[in-house]
Amino acid sequence: PCKILKCNSEFWSATSSGSHAPASDDVPEFCAALRTYALCTRRTARTCRGDLAYHSAVHGIEDLMSQHNCSKDGPTSQPRVRTLPPAGDSQERSDSPEICHYEKSFHKHSAAPNYTHCGLFGDPHLRTFTDHFQTCKVQGAWPLIDNNYLNVQVTNTPVLPGSAATATSKLTIIFKNFQECVDQKVYQAEMDELPSAFADGSKNGGDKHGANSLKITEKVSGQHVEIQAKYIGTTIVVRQVGRYLTFAVRMPEEVVNAVEDRDSQGLYLCLRGCPLNQQIDFQAFRANAESPRRPAAASPSPVVPETFPYETAVAKCKEKLPVEDLYYQACVFDLLTTGDVNFTLAAYYALEDGKMLHSNKDKLHLFERTRELP
C-alpha cells in the first residue's frame, strides 16, 4: 500500500507549526525539512505514483520549494523529536505501565485532572477548549490541535461552489512518539473513508511496552470511530455524517497547554478559536433569515438553497435538538446555507459527543455566542 501519509506526517512533525509559513530565520531548516519530504515521496513513488495523495505531495513540495527559494540540493533534516514532559513524576521509571496511564500518574502529584472539550462539526462550527462557540470559514488545511503530544489537522472544503460555508472533508491526527508508551501513529480520515485503523494498519500504539494505552475502536463501520489515548488522558471521536466529518475531543488541561512555543504553536483552533477574519456572524445571518424577505447578501454563500425555508429548517432542527442552544442555531444555519439535511445529524451528534466528553454537564448547552478570541 501507499505510505505517502508517513511522509506527510513526518514533514508535519518536522515543521512543528504545520500549515504556517516559517519565520525568515527558520527558512534553512524549513528547506531541509522540505528536501527530506521530497526524498520520502520519491521513495514511495513505486507504490504511490498512481494515487492523488502522492501527486498532491509532489506538487505541494514544488510550490513550497519555489515560495521559499529552497535549492533542490542541500542538507535534509531528521523529523524533530521533541523532549516531551513526562506524564507523571519525573522520577518514575519509564518502563512502568503507570507512565502510560495519565490518570494514574497524574494522581501521584495532583488532584484529579481538569478535562476540557473541543468539537468541530457542520459548516464548520467550532467549540473551543474554553467553551467559545464560533462559526468559521477556515477553507483549506488548518491546525485544530498542535501540542507536544499530538497534532490534529483538518481540511475544509466549500459545501457549495463559491460558498464561504465549508465543511470538514479530511482529518489527520498524529499521535507523537511518547516514551515507552507509543510509537508515532497517524490516523487519517477523508470523505467516504473512515478507517478503523491507523495509517500503518495497526489498531494500537505499536510495539512498545505501553502500546495498548493508544487504542482505536470502530463503533459504527464507516461512520463512527473512537480513539483512546490513555497515556495523555485523551478521548477522540471522529464521525462521518452525510458527506462530511465531525471531530470531538476530551483532553486534560495540562495536555491542552503543553506547547513549547506559545507564540506559534499555541495558535491552534481548539485553543485560540478561529481568527476574526475567518469567523461568520451567524447571529446576523439568523436575524436576516427570520425576516420575511431574505436578502442574499446576508448569507455567507452566494447560492442559498431554496430547499429549506426558515420554518422547515427550524422544525427539522427542533426535532433533533429541542433545546434552542447554539447547537440548535448551528443546525438551522447549516440547513439554510446548504440545504443538506445531514447537517441536522452533525449538530445532534456533536451535542451527544459533548455530553460524553465534556466534564461540566452544566456547560454543555451554550446560549451566548462569543466572537472575540479567548
Epitope: P1, C2, K3, L39, R42, R43, T44, R46, T47, C48, R49, G50, D51, L52, A53, Y54, H55, E190, M191, D192, E193, G222
Partner: antibody, heavy 115, light 112 residues
Amino acid sequence: EVQLVESGGGLVQPGSSLKLSCVASGFTFSNYGMNWIRQAPKKGLEWIGMIYYDSSEKHYADSVKGRFTISRDNSKNTLYLEMNSLRSEDTAIYYCAKGTTPDYWGQGVMVTVSS
Amino acid sequence: DVVLTQTPVSLSVTLGDQASMSCRSSQSLEYSDGYTFLEWFLQKPGQSPQLLIYEVSNRFSGVPDRFIGSGSGTDFTLKISRVEPEDLGVYYCFQATHDPLTFGSGTKLEIK
C-alpha cells in the same frame, strides 16, 4: 468497507471484444490508482495493468499491450477494461484491485475465449 | 521482466506447527534507500487474493502477527509461526519495484 464488484464477463469467440467494468465503493475512488489482474484456470496470477487516479498514465503488461485498454470514470466510481482481439490464452478470472499496488481485490469475473 | 521463483511448490504442515516458504527474485528488489516493494498475498480456496505483507515485513491491516515476512535484495521468506485451519490456500509473492509488476508462481499450503 472497501468493495469492488466486477462485471461484463462471459463466453466470447477468439478475435472478438469484451468490456469489463468494476464498480468501487467504501473508499474515495478518484484518489487512487487502480489495477487489473487475471488468473488463468488452475494457474497463477498475472498483472495486466494499472491506471493513475486521474487517467493521466496507464501501464500495461507486454502480453496485453495494444489489445487491452484500461479506463475509468471517476464520476461513476467505475474502472473499465476493454479487451480486443481476444485469444484463447486470455481465458481467465479478471480481478480489479485498489491502489497503485493492489491491496483490496474484487471477487473476479470469468472471461472464456473459445470457439 | 523480473521473475519470482517460489519454493516449495506445495507445503503440507500440521496445525500449530510453523510453515516457511521462499521467494527468490531474478534481480534485486531494493528500490531506494532500503525500500523494497515485495508483498505477499494469500488466495484461499474459491476466494480472491488478500494482502498479508507489504514492503517485505509489514503486516497489512487485520493480519495476525503469526505471519512474519523477512528478507532483502533477492531472497525473501514468509513464515507462519503457528498454522491455523484458515491459513490454507496458495501464497503468492509479488514485486512492485520494477515494471511490469510480477507475481511468483505460488506455494500451496495444505494441512496434514
